[in-house]
């Protein structure tokens, strides 16, 4: 399976909410021995491999923001902790999963990564990730609402086996 990032860049004004999105593509094993671990974290550019560094989002680690379920099931993060930080991650039945960030500030600008780990019990695990950039802007050059820029077809499907 692959992870697609429909948008590679989100440009938002301060104070706005944004939902960053990834999509699980390809054949997904829905067997009882397979579960999916999905999460989000921040990273930085200029590494040998994008998304290799895992940094927290608003002080929440990738463990705090994870979703754990089978196949294309819907799920949400534990509300209390995330919502206190203005965050919510969610997943639907169609392989889409997202993180919503409320009341953006300039400090939220940066590179965001979604991670999917397919865990086969008693077997190996398969990891893929997607990357996207969030630019929070203020002043005259801010947009009135979030503007999203599609990934090039080459960029939109990141395959990174662990």
């Amino acid at each position: 399976f692959k992870v697609a990032t429909p948008y590679s860049l989100y440009v938002c004004p301060e104070g706005q909410n944004v939902t960053l999105t990834c999509r699980l593509l390809g054949p997904v094993d829905k067997g009882h021995d397979v579960t999916f671990y999905k999460t989000w974290y921040r990273s930085s550019r200029g590494e040998v491999q994008t998304c290799s560094e895992r940094r927290p989002i608003r002080n929440l680690t990738f463990q705090d923001l994870h979703l754990h379920h089978g196949g294309h099931q819907a799920a949400n993060t534990s509300h209390d902790l995330a919502q206190r930080h203005g965050l919510e991650s969610a997943s639907d039945h169609h392989g889409n999963f997202s993180i919503t960030m409320r009341n953006l500030t300039l400090l939220d600008s940066g590179l965001y990564c979604c991670l999917v780990v397919e865990i086969r019990h008693h077997h190996s695990e398969h990891r893929v990730h997607g990357a996207m950039e969030l630019q929070v802007q203020t002043g005259k050059d801010a947009p009135s609402n979030c503007v999203v820029y599609p990934s090039s077809s080459q960029d939109s499907e990141n395959i990174t086996a662990a």
């Epitope: 004004p13 104070g15 005259k140 050059d141 947009p143 009135s144 609402n145 503007v147 820029y149």
Partner: antibody
Framework: EVKVEESGGGLVQPGGSMKLSCAAS????????MDWVHQSPEKGLEWVAE??????????YYVESVEGRFTISRDDSKSSVFLQVNSLRPEDTGIYYC??????????WGQGTLVTVSA | DIVLTQSPAIMSASLGEEITLTCSAS?????MHWYQQKSGTSPKVLIY???NLASGVPSRFSGSGSGTFYSLTISSVEAGDAAAYYC????????FGGGTKLEIK
């Protein structure tokens, strides 16, 4: 249906003042970022001023040539935006359009109001 | 400020012809927007964010480009397309091109 309608233009002498008004409907006005755009044969289309929503502290921005002479304001209770134009110059002559900004472009435009600055 | 230069200033086209209007920026911009202004009316957005067709705009219109060079293409010109076309960018400071006037032969 989104509607934007300007009024208040007319003939004014150099150095004079007037207040342009814009009434909007068909969208949540209090959330909108509203702009004025000027059009003249000499300058073409030129952005003039912007006022942002209450969530953005009604921040205002101006093109350099009108800074200190023009003032943009809004009344969310009346879904209206205003442009107070003072110390008018002949080069301010033209049509003034009220627009609503979406992202980085002007999504909706009024029919415009003509301002003529002449002795 | 970023200066947008449109060419040609005036263009004449036959019905059914495919035409391309261009807009060149003095510095690289992330996006370009295009407006159509028919005689005696206000501008109307045609294309936003370089490629996106505004609501109600026929699919004969399309936009493309990146960096400093952008274009608007009309795949099959119709009589109702006679108008002035303006490009627009909003970097740290919004500017418009001088326009291309399209005349129908």
């Amino acid at each position: 249906e989104v509607k934007v309608e300007e009024s208040g233009g007319g003939l004014v002498q150099p150095g004079g003042s007037m207040k342009l008004s814009c009434a909007a409907s068909g969208f949540t006005f209090s959330d909108a970022w509203m702009d004025w755009v000027h059009q003249s044969p000499e300058k073409g289309l030129e952005w003039v001023a912007e006022i942002r929503s209450k969530a953005n502290n009604h921040a205002t921005y101006y093109v350099e040539s009108v800074e200190g002479r023009f003032t943009i304001s809004r009344d969310d209770s009346k879904s209206s935006v205003f442009l107070q134009v003072n110390s008018l110059r002949p080069e301010d002559t033209g049509i003034y359009y009220c627009t609503r900004r979406d992202g980085y472009y002007f999504a909706y435009w009024g029919q415009g109001t003509l301002v003529t600055v002449s002795a | 400020d970023i200066v947008l230069t449109q060419s040609p200033a005036i263009m004449s086209a036959s019905l059914g012809e495919e035409i391309t209007l261009t807009c060149s920026a003095s510095s690289s911009v992330r996006d370009m927007h295009w407006y159509q202004q028919k005689s005696g009316t206000s501008p109307k957005v045609l294309i936003y964010n370089t490629f996106n067709l505004a609501s109600g705009v026929p699919s004969r219109f399309s936009g493309s480009g990146s960096g400093t060079f952008y274009s608007l293409t009309i795949s099959s010109v119709e009589a109702g397309d006679a108008a002035a076309y303006y490009c627009h960018q909003w970097s740290s400071y919004p500017t418009f091109g001088g326009g291309t006037k399209l005349e129908i032969k």
